[in-house]
Every structure is written in structure tokens, then in C-alpha cells.
Amino acid sequence: MMTGTIETTGNISAEKGGSIILQCHLSSTTAQVTQVNWEQQDQLLAICNADLGWHISPSFKDRVAPGPGLGLTLQSLTVNDTGEYFCIYHTYPDGTYTGRIFLEVLESSVAEHGARF
């Protein structure tokens, strides 16, 4: 029986050009985490495998850094990075747990660059 739950940072926002940490945490289970996938709906960003270590997709190699921990750091953000990100925990013996984070990448804030009257 799957008793675990995934806690995520939920909905987050960051500025264009900045960086963000995508983080999930699996709790309420003693299952062993054997692999974590970080994915968008249409592509894989990275895999952290207990035996093989980290794999970063070539599409993201220049902008993604592994960690901290099982998380992922996304750098040099663009507006196109806005969207949903999935952390997929492969565990034994429970199976697979999925969490989701919605990232909104904003143009530089009005406070910094907005018109002043």
C-alpha cells in the first residue's frame, strides 16, 4: 500500500534571467527512493538514479544544475520556462509517487523597471 505523500514548493514565480530551485520531498513512507525524474509534460529534464547518478537532458545541460539533494536548479530563466514541472519518485516497494510544481517566469518587476510618476 502506498502511504507516502509528496510535498512540493507548489506554485512559484521567478524573474526572467534568474534561477529557481525545484524541490520535492517524499514523506510518510519508509520506502527506498531508487530514482527521481524531473519532467515537463512533453520532455524529461533530468534523472537522479541511486546507482547511476545524475543525467541531465542535452536540451537543458547549459541551464540545469543537479541539486540541492534530489532537487533541481533551473538557471537563466526565460518566459518559455513558465509551466508545470513534475517530480517522479520511483520507490521500492511502494511504486511511483508524483508531485507537481507550477513555475511562472515574470518579466523584470514593475518596481525595478516600471514608469515612475
Partner: antibody, heavy 118, light 107 residues
Amino acid sequence: DVQLQESGPGLVKPSQTLSLTCTVTGYSITSDYAWNWIRQPPGKGLEWMGYISYSGSARYNPSLKSRITISRDTSMNQFSLKLNSVTAEDTATYYCARKGYPAYFAYWGQGTLVTVSS
Amino acid sequence: DIQMTQSPSSLSASVGDRVSITCKASQDVSTAVAWYQQKPGQAPRLLIYSASYRYTGVPDRFSGSGSGTDFTLTISSLQAEDVAVYYCQHHYSTPYTFGQGTKLEIK
């Protein structure tokens, strides 16, 4: 339990539009996942055609991109395939399937054979 | 697109035999590979995902291994009901592609 069921005409004339619908029961297509079309010509392998995600965004196989549209009817819990300008090479069994996380296909319809012939 | 090449295209083995089917990806897909079984007149059935994780309800005689570009589906002790066509699929990015299939028969 999640069930998917394809429906639509079994015979389409060349140059016309193939239209199929997948009815999903036991799960709302707006709740999660991506909802796919996969086809299999007689005696051949499987080809992923595209999907519409639970949020409504679509992705298509570039080999079909100019001809394919996947849409949905949330009130009926259905999603649909339209394939334009069909030829005999589009004769296949068409499956609808749910993509999981990661992107495997655990739930499939039983498939419907569409023949393109005049 | 990432191409998936399966071998052999067909295979005949005896009940109780250990059987292996291989799949080669045209680029590194890490562990993003699934395996399916398709019996005549039926939809494919998911057996393995992420290269080595057995899907719910799949008998433990089916196992998967590999990473990078080379992957294997193994049936440890072939049963008569395992006669089918087996397909690999990468789940790395769209467009998802499948191997051409391996037809498994009983001797």
C-alpha cells in the same frame, strides 16, 4: 477503474478527413495526465501521433503535424482526433491511451480499425 | 527523433526457457524506456517503465535492465501465455517512438 473507448467510422475515402473520438470513463480528462492517440498499421509497429494534456495543450508528432488536430470535449469527457488528407498509408488500428508519469502508456482503448479506401 | 531498434525481430523458445529481447536507442535516453506486450487482437499492455520498474500486476518473471542506449527485457521462465509481440518505447521526449517489435513464439 479508468476505461477508454474509441469510436468513429471504419472506412474513410482518400483525401478526406479521418475523425475519431475517445470516450473516457472512470477519470476526468481535465484532472490530470495527457490523453494520446497511437496507431498501428496492419501487421506493423506502433506510432505515437500526439496528445492533449489535462490543461488543454496539445503536442503532435512532427511527421503528422500539418495534418493532425487533437481536441477535447470536457462536458462529455471525450477527446478527438482529426487527420486530414488521408491516404492508404493511414489505414491502421487507432488506439487512444493515457500517458502517465513518466511518459508510459498504462491505459489503452481496445482500438478501432480505420481503412482508407475508395 | 530518437530511433529505437529491437532485436531479434522474431524468436522461438521452449516453455521454461530464459528469453531476452534487446532494444537500442539512437541516443542516450538514460533510463527512459518502457516495454509492452501485445497479443493478437489486443491493445499493448505495459510491462516495464523507466527501464527496470515492473508495472502493477506484471508477473515477476518479466524484468528490464539497461541505461543509456542499450536495454533488455528478460523473461526468466517462458510460459505459454507469453506468446506475443513485444515492443520497447522511449519516454524521454516527444515524439515518443517504439521499436519495430519482437515476435515471440513457443517451440
